[in-house]
């Protein structure tokens, strides 16, 4: 007996061939011997089965001895053994129809779980193997669960259902709602304008929701809201902004914030949260601000940084075109009685300069 696997909602063609390449009598019946369709004279006739309105045959191939049955808009309950009677012989074809669907909306927040459920006919014992767009392989039976979705899980998932050495492939489009980056750090000299950008890792026709940037300044004992906003059809409107600092926000996506001046008291880390309409939970992006200040006071030249820096970062004071350098894996370096000239303060990570500030030391006579 031949086994054919079908997908719920799809169309399947069950083939039946006569030895003579000519038009002849044929019938398709189900396992209960109820006629589905057949030929009477030159016409296709349909029996009283539940399939009658969805079953058809390729008349153009009859004179070649091909008497296939086409079933449209497959249902799980169409799974059955179908019998083709032609030239006094019977050909049996077992049709197994499977369905694979996501248990919830296919637009899911990062960190949420995805469950794929397999619908299968009674008595079948299929196995399912899914491959994510990022190449992650997950196997299961009737259900497949991905406990915590990541950005890279966005895209088309390919799932293969196997039964009796036959396979059928499903493609499910999953959109993971997340920011493009989990975290970003902005390095600025004191007084410079700061730009924070929060691009999304997805596009939606209509994007509506609300959000907030919550900030923990390194120097402050507690965190506070810097700005709250609404998003209506991709248009941003500010709801409330703190008086210090006076942030500005772009009116269009991507979400964009401007801090007029980088100051030591603003250095720290923030969390931008975005709630989307009809979704429970929020998208998050961490943002860090590191501020550098180089100052000369009396006989002391000092360079300081504020904000979240890793212990492996190096802070250096270097006299331009001279070898004089002082370096430390610390948040402040200084030189007593510095030579006159242009000094550079550098914040670097394994030789890569992240931030630099120049300060001119004038000779004292």
């Amino acid at each position: 007996k031949k086994v054919v696997l079908g997908k719920k909602g799809d169309t399947v063609e069950l083939t039946c061939n006569a030895s003579q390449k000519k038009n002849t009598q044929f019938h398709w019946k189900n396992s209960n011997q109820i006629k589905i369709l057949g030929i009477q004279g030159l016409f296709l006739t349909k029996g009283p089965s539940k399939l009658s309105d969805r079953a058809d045959s390729r008349k153009s191939l009859w004179d070649q001895g091909c008497f296939s049955m086409i079933i449209k808009n497959l249902k799980i309950e169409d799974s059955d053994t179908y019998i083709c009677e032609v030239e006094n012989k019977k050909e049996e074809v077992e049709l197994l129809v499977f369905g694979l669907t996501a248990n919830s909306d296919t637009h899911l927040l990062e960190g949420q779980s995805l469950t794929l459920t397999l619908e299968s006919p009674p008595g079948s014992s299929p196995s399912v193997k899914c491959r994510s767009p990022g190449g992650k392989n997950i196997q299961g039976g009737r259900t497949i669960s991905v406990p915590q979705l990541e950005r890279q899980d966005s895209g088309t998932w390919t799932c293969t259902v196997s039964q009796d050495q036959k396979t059928v492939e499903f493609k499910i489009d999953i959109v993971v709602l997340a920011f493009q980056k989990a975290s970003s750090t902005v390095y600025k000299k004191e007084g410079e304008q700061v730009e924070f950008s929060f691009p999304l890792a997805f596009t939606l026709e209509k994007l509506t929701g609300s959000g907030e940037l919550w900030w923990q300044a390194e120097r402050a004992s507690s965190s506070k809201s810097w700005i709250t906003f609404d998003l209506k059809n991709k248009e941003v409107s500010v709801k409330r902004v703190t008086q210090d600092p006076k942030l500005q926000m772009g009116k269009k996506l991507p979400l964009h914030l401007t801090l007029p001046q980088a100051l030591p008291q603003y250095a720290g880390s923030g969390n931008l949260t975005l709630a989307l309409e009809a979704k429970t939970g929020k998208l998050h992006q961490e943002v860090n601000l590191v501020v550098m200040r180089a100052t000369q006071f009396q006989e002391n030249l000092t360079c300081e940084v504020w904000g979240p820096t890793s212990p492996k970062l190096t802070l250096s004071l270097k006299l331009e075109n001279k070898g004089a350098t002082v370096s430390k894996q610390a948040k402040a370096v200084w030189v007593l009685n510095p030579e006159a000239g242009m000094w550079q303060c550098l914040l670097s990570d394994s030789g890569q300069v992240l931030l630099e500030s120049n300060i001119k030391v004038v000779p004292t006579w």
Partner: antibody
Framework: EVQLVESGGGLVQPGGSLRLSCAAS????????MSWVRQAPGKGLEWVAN????????YYVDSVKGRFTISRDNAKNSLYLQMNSLRAEDTAVHYC????????????WGQGTLVTVSS | DIQMTQSPSSVSGSVGDRVTITCRAS??????LAWYQQKPGKAPKLLIY???SLQSGVPSRFSGSGSGTDFTLTISSLQPEDFVTYYC?????????FGQGTKVEIK
Amino acid sequence: EVQLVESGGGLVQPGGSLRLSCAASGFTFSSYWMSWVRQAPGKGLEWVANIKEDGSDKYYVDSVKGRFTISRDNAKNSLYLQMNSLRAEDTAVHYCVREGGQWLALDYWGQGTLVTVSS
Amino acid sequence: DIQMTQSPSSVSGSVGDRVTITCRASQGISSWLAWYQQKPGKAPKLLIYGASSLQSGVPSRFSGSGSGTDFTLTISSLQPEDFVTYYCQQANSFPWTFGQGTKVEIK
């Protein structure tokens, strides 16, 4: 530790006036919007008014507009509610509240002061 | 003004039960919704902000969901101290408004 302590409640006749005060400590008072929320005996919560960090913006519920005035003195870490033309329906415990929670939530509440308007 | 309608006005349960309180806004408020708990004779305490985020220090048996106009507060397993009153509040537009409250009572 954040602390909000209300005072100034008491018994007053209809048409009379009362000034509620709230002394704030444990946080940078001048960095937060502040609210007054009240609760009539055995009833639910009703937001009354709020004020911006520097006092430049004020909002009121319709039932108190023109009768109540919210103000603040950042130098004294104090919030005030001047209540004029008091009515029996103003009888309630009045809470001083900080609007410092994420997503504009009311994160710290005082213990409340009872205002009774009765003849 | 935005009307906030809480239901039910009271609910009975036993220790360990799961309880759900709903709050409906008369117009869309996105996620500008907070839930508060109030014990008799005490000031309210913030439980949930932004419709679904748990305030620091609040037990994880409390959870919030919803956006737009329909919101829920769920207590997954009632504890003896949870038999008090709960309020929802919108912060979408002035005046801020509260639901009428839901009293959780011992069965």
